[in-house]
């Protein structure tokens, strides 16, 4: 069985301020079980943008219905983009662990650039 890979097909995305950014991510397998999370930045200081398991992320919606048992599309939309949202976004697959889930595979990242609104 092929090991799961996390695919972020877009190296970069350019979005106008005030618009919605779509960040694409797919997994190549349903196994191992575990949640997907999105982060801005890498390393210890990275910012959690979306967690499939829990939390309230009012600006974020998923492109697909993640409650489908065969879902492998973890793309997200982030609304009302501002220049402060610029950065590199990573789609990260975790595998279940006890007591905490363990990072398993990360996508290569998508750089979000924000074009200022014309004045």
């Amino acid at each position: 069985e092929e090991e799961l890979q996390v695919i972020q097909p877009d190296k970069s995305v350019l979005v106008a301020a005030g618009e919605t950014a779509t960040l694409r991510c797919t997994a190549t397998s349903l196994i191992p079980v575990g949640p997907i999370q999105w982060f801005r930045g890498a390393g210890p200081g990275r910012e959690l943008i979306y967690n499939q398991k829990e939390g309230h992320f009012p600006r974020v919606t998923t492109v697909s219905d993640l409650t489908k048992r065969n879902n492998m599309d973890f793309s997200i939309r982030i609304g009302n983009i501002t220049p402060a949202d610029a950065g590199t976004y990573y789609c990260v697959k975790f595998r279940k662990g006890s007591p905490d889930d363990v990072e398993f595979k990360s996508g290569a990242g998508t750089e979000l650039s924000v074009r200022a609104k014309p004045s």
């Epitope: 349903l30 196994i31 079980v33 829990e54 048992r69 065969n70 279940k96 006890s98």
Partner: antibody
């Protein structure tokens, strides 16, 4: 407070049909996958159907596939189970259950009894 | 027949620790939960995602996993804990929700 209230149970003859309903409240129904789980008298729990939040994808074990149909109306916050070609072995209490993000169950209704008997 | 295997019965004295095991699922494709059911009542979720406890469940109930076996531990068992306990799972490889046959917990005395 999450509430799930089943209805529609009763006595039906073998080969007959019945539709169960589950009225949901206290949470955003359209955001959660849902399932039906049954329990025959004196027996254990058996999952019989699941449905995605949007309602487009449904799942069944072999024991009921082709006879039972799960559906939902998100505008009415209601889950359904259409049961056809009923058999004596379908006699059970039927519970609706809310699914967690990973398809386990966190909240259960009180159940409705279905008796298949001639 | 049940896909998940758990003992039919466990007996324990009040104040002691009860452990109920469940096995049968592949670690990489399974999530487990534990459900408590008292006579004439609906099941109540005690543990989900192998070891996570809902906020309304007493701390004496805990879940753990080791390989393909999960364990429900009830510390300081009380008379009110006498009930049937079901192990349930989600199998990502088949999109199904198997259950164990249930374990009757008897609190002695």
């Amino acid at each position: 407070e999450v509430q799930l209230v089943e209805s529609g149970g009763g006595v039906v003859q073998p080969g007959g049909s019945l539709r169960l309903s589950c009225a949901a409240s206290g949470f955003t129904f359209s955001s959660n996958a849902m399932s039906w789980v049954r329990q025959a008298p004196g027996k254990g729990l058996e999952w019989v159907a699941g449905i995605s939040a949007g309602g487009s994808d449904t799942y069944y074990p072999a024991s009921v596939k082709g006879r039972f149909t799960i559906s939902r109306d998100n505008s009415k916050n209601t889950l359904y189970l259409q049961m056809n070609s009923l058999r004596a072995e379908d006699t059970a209490v039927y519970y609706c259950a809310r699914e967690t993000w990973n398809h386990l169950f966190d909240y259960w209704g009180q159940g409705t009894l279905v008796t298949v008997s001639s | 027949s049940y896909e998940l295997t758990q003992p039919p019965s466990v007996s324990v004295s009040p104040g002691q620790t009860a452990r109920i095991t469940c096995s049968g699922g592949s670690y990489s494709s399974y999530y487990y939960a534990w459900y408590q059911q008292k006579p004439g009542q609906a099941p109540v979720t005690l543990i989900y995602s192998d070891d996570k406890r809902p906020s309304n469940i007493p701390e004496r109930f805990s879940g753990s996993s080791s390989g393909t076996t999960v364990t429900l531990t009830i510390s300081g068992v009380q008379a009110e804990d006498e009930a049937d306990y079901y192990c349930g799972g989600y199998d990502q490889s088949s999109y199904t929700n198997p259950f164990g046959g249930g374990t009757k917990l008897t609190v002695l005395g």
